[in-house]
């Protein structure tokens, strides 16, 4: 007897982080033998949607014409072939931005920082929130979470970076969120450009915009050092 059917691939276009009101298409790619594709959403009792395969039958399209809170969440897909159902795909986490007002992102003491020194990025929200996320543009692993302990609500989160190197230079934004849904984020803060200049020992000029290369430092997760801030938030990075 043949083994289990290979699991399909699940992805979203233009991406998995979508602003409120924008359209998104979820794709599930299986095999040419697929007869039906099914999309399941975590905590949804019935199959969330089901579609015929598109020719040549190896994938299906699930359209969301206008992103709302209801669509945010964790999805998996399956396909059915003449011999039965496939294994589930790896999960897709569809995140909606625009659920809350935008926070303010600032750098202390300044967004102009000398290599080797320290800087703290401060994300502040008007209303109390329990999760703050810092995102660096063009980083392969851009999310850094600070989540409050015991559900305590906070107006701000500090992201200390020490010692700063040229890798830390670039454009940052932050988001705020409530813990009851990791899939609903605020509008993004206005961008903050962190400019790292060379130290006395290292006088090389530092570019004011980070440039991502195929295997350059921008592809590494942002891992700032320093003590956990005193705001009652715990650091989580992905």
């Amino acid at each position: 007897q043949a083994g289990p059917l290979p699991k399909p691939t699940l992805w979203a276009e233009p991406g998995s982080v979508i602003s409120w009101g924008n359209s998104v298409t979820i794709w599930c790619q299986g095999t040419l033998e697929a007869r039906e594709y099914r999309l399941d959403k975590e905590e949804s009792p019935a199959p969330w949607d089901r579609q015929n395969p598109l020719e040549p039958k190896n994938k299906a399209r699930f359209s969301i014409p206008s992103m709302t809170e209801d669509y945010a969440g964790r999805y998996r897909c399956y396909y059915r072939s003449p011999v039965g159902w496939s294994q589930p795909s790896d999960p897709l986490e569809l995140v909606m931005t625009g659920a809350y007002s935008k926070p303010t992102l600032s750098a202390l003491p300044s967004p102009l920082v000398t290599s080797g020194k320290s800087v703290t990025l401060l994300c502040q929200s008007r209303s109390p929130m329990d999760t703050f996320l810092l995102i660096k543009e063009r980083a392969a692993h851009p999310l850094l979470h600070l989540r409050s302990e015991h559900g305590a609500q906070q107006h701000q989160a500090e992201f200390p970076m020490s010692p700063v190197t040229s890798v830390h230079g670039g454009t940052y934004r932050c988001f705020s969120s409530h813990g009851f849904s990791h899939y609903l984020l605020s509008h993004p803060s206005d961008p903050l450009e962190l400019i790292v200049s060379g130290s006395l020992e290292d006088p090389r000029p530092s570019p004011t915009r980070s440039v991502s290369t195929a295997a350059g430092p921008e592809d590494q997760p942002l891992m700032p050092t320093g003590s956990v801030p005193h705001s009652g938030l715990r650091r989580h990075w992905e």
Epitope: E36, A46, W48
Partner: antibody, heavy 120, light 107 residues
Framework: EVQLQQPGAELVKPGASVKLSCKAS????????MHWVKQRPGQGLEWIGE????????NYNEKFKSKATLTVDKSSSTAYVQLNSLTSEDSAVYYC?????????????WGQGTSVTVSS | DIVMTQTTSSLSASLGDRVTISCRAS??????LNWYQQKPDGTVKLLIY???RLHSGVPSRFSGSGSGTDYSLTISNLEQEDIATYFC?????????FGGGTKLEIK
Amino acid sequence: EVQLQQPGAELVKPGASVKLSCKASGYTFTSYWMHWVKQRPGQGLEWIGEINPSNGRTNYNEKFKSKATLTVDKSSSTAYVQLNSLTSEDSAVYYCARDRYDEGNAMDYWGQGTSVTVSS
Amino acid sequence: DIVMTQTTSSLSASLGDRVTISCRASQDITNYLNWYQQKPDGTVKLLIYYTSRLHSGVPSRFSGSGSGTDYSLTISNLEQEDIATYFCQQGDTLPRTFGGGTKLEIK
């Protein structure tokens, strides 16, 4: 006991619209898709489309895309089909049926059907 | 769309007979074939799903078989209450489609 309750009959004028209801009981309404099926007098069964009551996702038979609109009201566990621009061709019995969703993709419980007569 | 054909539109049989109703699909439907009974008053019930599985509460005199494009419903010992029209339906792809029905009458 699973029950799908539909009104017995509707008399409507040509060009008008009608909204048919199907009230579900005896199971968790949001856990099963709902189908709508048309049967003209003395004819076979035609699938109009299906709706997921938990999120409102729909799939339609292309033939009925401009004729029928499927909706649900979760608070009353009721599914609806609205038929617009009615003509004599729309005179038929309309059934709602619950989706079994497992092997077969069958419709395991059916309403009694609503007879729609289009006449001036 | 997949076309479902029930070539016999009506069938006469005697009580106690073994009756077979056939259904053909325009393409392989991978056993996603269901059978329904419609009584003269319009009531519709599911009898068999996935070719051969008996729906709950359906008498065991009903059975189904087939594969690929050809399927059949058998009533092993015809009873008066079985007088009805029988429809096949494919659940393999959207849109769902039905056969034209076979009306079963008593001789």
